[in-house]
Interface confidence: medium
Amino acid sequence: QEGKFSGPLKPMTFSIYEGQEPSQIIFQFKANPPAVTFELTGETDNIFVIEREGLLYYNRALDRETRSTHNLQVAALDANGIIVEGPVPITIKVKDINDNRPTFLQSKYEGSVRQNSRPGKPFLYVNATDLDDPATPNGQLYYQIVIQLPMINNVMYFQINNKTGAISLTREGSQELNPAKNPSYNLVISVKDMGGQSENSFSDTTSVDIIVTENIWKAPKPVEMVENSTDPHPIKITQVRWNDPGAQYSLVDKEKLPRFPFSIDQEGDIYVTQPLDREEKDAYVFYAVAKDEYGKPLSYPLEIHVKVKDINDNPPTCPSPVTVFEVQENERLGNSIGTLTAHDRDEENTANSFLNYRIVEQTPKLPMDGLFLIQTYAGMLQLAKQSLKKQDTPQYNLTIEVSDKDFKTLCFVQINVIDINDQIPIFEKSDYGNLTLAEDTNIGSTILTIQATDADEPFTGSSKILYHIIKGDSEGRLGVDTDPHTNTGYVIIKKPLDFETAAVSNIVFKAENPEPLVFGVKYNASSFAKFTLIVTDVNEAPQFSQHVFQAKVSEDVAIGTKVGNVTAKDPEGLDISYSLRGDTRGWLKIDHVTGEIFSVAPLDREAGSPYRVQVVATEVGGSSLSSVSEFHLILMDVNDNPPRLAKDYTGLFFCHPLSAPGSLIFEATDDDQHLFRGPHFTFSLGSGSLQNDWEVSKINGTHARLSTRHTEFEEREYVVLIRINDGGRPPLEGIVSLPVTFCSCVEGSCFRPAGHQTGIPTVGM
């Protein structure tokens, strides 16, 4: 069978499974004169043989783990043993079978984890090796937690990355681990080959002892600080501590105060830097942050609460320079004249703001002193001794002392004695007829003038008239303003009129005095008037139930998913058709009838969130009036962006020859959402072949260091592939390339002869 098992001498590659006893020849080479015999050289390992006539075979089972490729040469010789053809390369690739079990590098691992550590952040790696080919399932390892001891309420506190062996806390572990309750745990971890998928896989186990350490990064108790402290500042008020020394502490004022009177030192001690004033601000909430040496937050911020304790540093204040009250001539003893309400800026409902009232002087003292009394705590003035006479004394002036426990303030009250209120207001007409208005009449319009008169003393509370609508306007669409000089009432529109809900309103007005009527006098029909308001229809645009509609969905929702809905009603009851405006990205469609909004394309938070479009509601029929509202779609992040280099790193170079191993630092980023702590990338070399020359080590969640392992580099450009994993759900990996040039240097810069100006590296390492 020419071609498959026999043929002329030429370079060839054969694949043979390891572990199999020889069952057939590999190949029969045919000699072309003057060649008569064949010779085999190279990595034969005394397994591969060629007979003089050209029959290539092997004499015992191969072992890929001893040698995965045998590089052989076959030459054709003439009768004198001189090579007349070849030698040509013959490559034997040994194919892997699963003949090696995985083994852990250690039979026991020990590690520690801090309580409340971030879920999913590895704190320990277990590592197993398998001599089989990692490019096949035979060498693909799968890690699993077999058991966790103790197991509380059947809840796993630990998890393992099946591929990397990274052990981290679960969300429950992050929340519930407590060294005071359980300081140590034991895990039994298994590793299987065949990617864990086959019943025929080999396995190994190891034991992991985990110590739980206390997390001392905790919010301190709320602090109370007395205002106006005269002690020397700054004063230490509390402290925070990161779990290890060397953290850089700072305070964050979320309220963005113009004056932020707190500071923190590099031990985590928190100080108030100046006296506080409770009346300016009675409580502060701010955050303490701990960062690493690169300025990356080490954990979540702690909330610090400071309550400012009151001292009595404010005197009572009067409501106005002079407070004026009126009292009718005939009022009886004990009647209330009015209440003086003084204020105190100190803390409410405490002794510091609790006020006492006392009359210290009455002028004139006619017909006697002590005509008035004031309730000590309420400040209510009452008539104390007798009814007053206007012709004797039309006005009294009182000096009232208002005091808290430390301060006294004098307030002044003027009491005007006025005529008795024995006349009621009388409307000039009892019926103001009909008034027809369109429903779109402007708010603030005066639609009617009404007038009542009162024969009591002018410009007193006995003759002043207040108009009230007592019937026919339960919605409060109308109001009445009174001119204090003429007692004219102006009926105005306060809220939009509405034909659909109130086409005809029978309005009733009442005219009253602010002063009480004397005993025996009552308001009667003369103090009431009416009018009829007729509202005519105006075709109005539909009305949305909200100015802004908001919905929240994950950015990876399937096309066709309902993402929200809007509703509008037409005042005239017409049907409504919905449409979208400003859907610049073409992501959405709206159901014209129901107002439901659906996705019609893949959404992308990184393109911008929230996504804002306008929704339009249009009358069907009629005059096709329309209204516009906003729809805001908030897109929640999913991990859909692999890490990449944060900037362009072309132009990195080392001066050749290297005198010592060198290193350079690079930064990664990705476009997904990273909350307070930022990304937590892991870094590794992109291919195994790079490991002899380079190593990559993580500095923090975003930065890593690429170092040379030796100094024996050629004078050329090397492209170093680096794998960056974001550890997200699901984890995404980016492979980036860092081009590093080794070049002759002049004064620390790459030297290029003339004519070699392209791509000159610009950054020396």
């Epitope: 206390e214 001392i216 501590r241 990161w242 779990n243 020394p245 060397g246 031990e267």
Partner: nanobody, 118 residues
Framework: QVQLQESGGGLVQPGGSTRLSCVSS???????MGWFRQAPGKEREFVAL????????EYSDDVHGRFTVSRGNTQNSVNLQMNNLKPEDTGIYYC????????????WGQGTQVTVSS
Amino acid sequence: QVQLQESGGGLVQPGGSTRLSCVSSRTFSYYDMGWFRQAPGKEREFVALLSWRGNNAEYSDDVHGRFTVSRGNTQNSVNLQMNNLKPEDTGIYYCAVTYGGARSVRLWGQGTQVTVSS
């Protein structure tokens, strides 16, 4: 290896006084130093703690007002002056280096015996 070396203690009459000293073989920035004790048949308990700067001291309720913790001649040493001793103060006294309070001990001394008895 870093070591803590305690000295002092021994047999003391009730009502009497003694002074314990502790020196660390290395200076720890930002770490606090203090004392713990373990009475026979009991768990080790907190006694006193001195902040790294030496400006804050903390005591257990049992010893407050009787014991005083102070910095030694150097930044890496700490003393415990024990006055008005009671029989219940008997135990092994351990020097400790902590960070962030009494519950986070990072390094223990070997301990020194204090016996209060007539």
